[in-house]
Structures are given as C-alpha cells and as structure tokens.
C-alpha cells in the first residue's frame, strides 16, 4: 500500500527574467527513491537517478539547473514558462508518486509565493 505523501511548493509566481526553485518532498513512507523525473506538461525537463545522477534535457540545458537536493531551478524565466510542473518520484517498493506545481511568470515586479499544499 502506498502511504507516502508528496509536499510541493504549490502555486508559485515569479518575475519574468528571474529564477525559481521547484521543490517536492516525499514523506510518510520508508520507500527508497530510485529516481525523480521533472516534467513540464509531458515534456521532460530533468532526471535525477539515485545511482547515475542528474540529466538535464538538452532542450533546457541553458535554463535549468539541478537542485537544491532533488529540486530544480528554472532560470531566465519567460511568460511561456507559465504552467504546470510535475515531480515524479519513482520509489521501491511503493511505486510512483506525483506532485504538481503551478508556476505563473509575471511581467510585473510583484510576485508572491503561494501556500504549500500536499498531494497524497
């Protein structure tokens, strides 16, 4: 039975041209994390494999940096970066946990972080 919970940074906003950290955290399970995939609307951004390390998709090499931890840093944000991001935790023996983050990239200088929330 899958008992874990993914906690994410939730709905967040950031300024155009700035950067943002996407963070997920898996809790309430003793399952081993074998890999974390980061996706933007079905497109692979990055992989963090427990044995082999990070892979940043060639399409995003110039604007995505690994970390901190299992998180992902998006740089040089544009309004086109607005949308859903998913952290997909592959674990053993539980299986797959998915967390969702919605990022809004704002033209204005006012960008506030939303509240944290959980996806079971």
């Amino acid at each position: 039975m899958m008992t874990g919970t993914i906690e994410t940074t939730g709905n967040i906003s950031a300024e155009k041209g700035g950067s943002i950290i996407l963070q997920c955290h898996l809790s309430s399970t003793t399952a081993q994390v074998t890999q974390v995939n980061w996706e933007q609307q079905d497109q692979l951004l990055a992989i963090c494999n427990a044995d082999l390390g990070w892979h940043i998709s060639p399409s995003f090499k110039d604007r995505v940096a690994p970390g901190p931890g299992l998180g992902l840093t998006l740089q040089s944000l544009t309004v086109n970066d607005t949308g859903e991001y998913f952290c997909i935790y592959h674990t053993y023996p539980d299986g797959t946990y998915t967390g969702r983050i919605f990022l809004e990239v704002l033209e204005s200088s006012v960008a506030e972080h939303g509240a944290r929330f959980q996806i079971p």
Epitope: Q35, N37, N49, L52, H55, I56, P58, S59, K61
Partner: antibody
Framework: EVQLVQSGAEVKKPGSSVKVSCKAS????????IGWVRQAPGQGLEWIGD????????NYNEKFKDRVTITADKSTSTAYMEFSSLRSEDTAVYYC???????????????WGQGTLVTVSS | DIVMTQSPDSLAVSLGERATINCKSS????????????LAWYQQKPGQPPKLLIY???TRESGVPDRFSGSGSGTDFTLTISSLQAEDVAVYYC?????????FGGGTKVEIK
C-alpha cells in the same frame, strides 16, 4: 555484458511501414536512453530519435518526426522503431544504441546493436 | 541544428605515424554547469556498427588503446592516433550530444599509405 540485439533484415515496398526491434540485456533498461541511428549505403550516420524507458520520453529528429514512432516495452527490455511511408531513399542499416547522457558520466552512445538492413524497393 | 564538419574526408598515413582528424561544430558544445564538452568520437570498420572511442572530448572509453586521444573545446575538436596500426583502418565520426537533434560529422576515412 551489455548487449543490444536487433531484429532481422527487411525488404519493404514503397509506401509501407517497417518495425524494427532492439532487445537490451546486461543493464537496467529503464536507466538509459535507447536511440536509433541510420546509415544509408556508403553514407554517414544520421540520428533518428531516442526514448528514455524510465518515463517513455521520446525525442525525434524533425526530419523524421512525421514518419517515425519510437516505443519501449519495459517488461521485455525491448525498444521499437516504426518507420512509415517508406521511400527508396530510406534504404539503410538502422542501428539501435544505448545512450548515457547523465551529467556525471555522459558516455554518449556507448553500445550499438548489430544493425538491421531495411531495403525499400518496388 | 548543430552542424558538425569533419576534415579531411580521407587520410592516408604510414604505419607508426600520427593521424589527426579535425571536427568543427557550428555552436559551442561546452556545458557551463559541468565544464564538459558534449563531443564523442566513433570508429567504424566495414560491415560493423560504430564503436565508441572517446566521449566528453577527451575521455577514452574502457578498452580503447591509449594511442587514441581527443582534445579541443567549444567548437574545435581533434582526434589523434599517435601511432597508426593496421587495425585502425576505419571511418571515424565525431558527434555532438549537447542538443537535439544529435548530429554527426560526415566521417573521415583513415587508410594506410
């Protein structure tokens, strides 16, 4: 020992499709990319696309995007490349490759299948 | 797309002599985060699939003789065979794996003079 074993040679008519398989062994299939590269007779190497089985993420060369579908079956550690609307100029040896594109190892296409000759002729 | 240009197209070298193959990319292959150039070299003998020789510009694949070496950075790269052996007769390809689509040079045929 890492091995990539491809299906046998094919002869196809123009306009038809071909599906080539690539069975991987000797490593964790989900952890590495499987790519497809072709080589026309006497010519150089051309990258078609790849798949990451640990998420089924695919990337295609725009030149082939409308005619190629790459899939993977994790249960059998087998990747497939289906090429449609074949033309005579698609006659080539098609290779599958294992790709290591991690930022800490980055060994590129470190293992290659033996190749599958696809001949397109009327 | 990144264009990979190899030179020369063919090369005839005496046994025991040095062979040098050049490869130029239309864009830099240097990834600033890990300071690695995403450039590989392959050897292909007649009737065989290509074989990885060198990755990240200069790292020899396991089992590759040390007479093969790679150098360069950014857009200009070189494969050197320090002392050509009969078994080195082959076609050599450079390849970038920095960005999609991955692309190869046109190949350099190395023969014995």
């Amino acid at each position: 020992e890492v091995q990539l074993v491809q299906s046998g040679a094919e002869v196809k008519k123009p306009g038809s499709s071909v599906k080539v398989s690539c069975k991987a062994s000797g490593y964790t299939f989900s952890n590495y990319w499987i790519g497809w590269v072709r080589q026309a007779p006497g010519q150089g190497l051309e990258w078609i696309g790849d798949i990451y089985p640990g998420g089924a993420y695919t990337n295609y060369n725009e030149k082939f995007k409308d005619r190629v579908t790459i899939t993977a079956d994790k249960s059998t550690s087998t990747a497939y490349m289906e090429f449609s609307s074949l033309r005579s100029e698609d006659t080539a040896v098609y290779y599958c490759t294992r790709g290591d594109y991690y930022d800490s190892s980055g060994r590129a296409m470190d293992y290659w299948g033996q190749g599958t000759l696809v001949t397109v002729s009327s | 797309d990144i264009v990979m240009t190899q030179s020369p197209d063919s090369l005839a070298v005496s046994l025991g002599e040095r062979a040098t193959i050049n490869c130029k990319s239309s864009q830099s292959l240097l990834y600033s985060r890990n300071q690695m150039n995403y450039l590989a070299w392959y050897q292909q003998k007649p009737g065989q699939p290509p074989k990885l020789l060198i990755y990240w510009t200069s790292t020899r694949e396991s089992g590759v003789p040390d007479r093969f070496s790679g150098s360069g950075s950014g857009t200009d790269f070189t494969l050197t065979i320090s002392s050509l052996q009969a078994e080195d007769v082959a076609v050599y390809y450079c390849q970038q794996y920095y960005s999609y689509p991955y692309t190869f040079g046109g190949g350099t045929k190395v023969e014995i003079k």
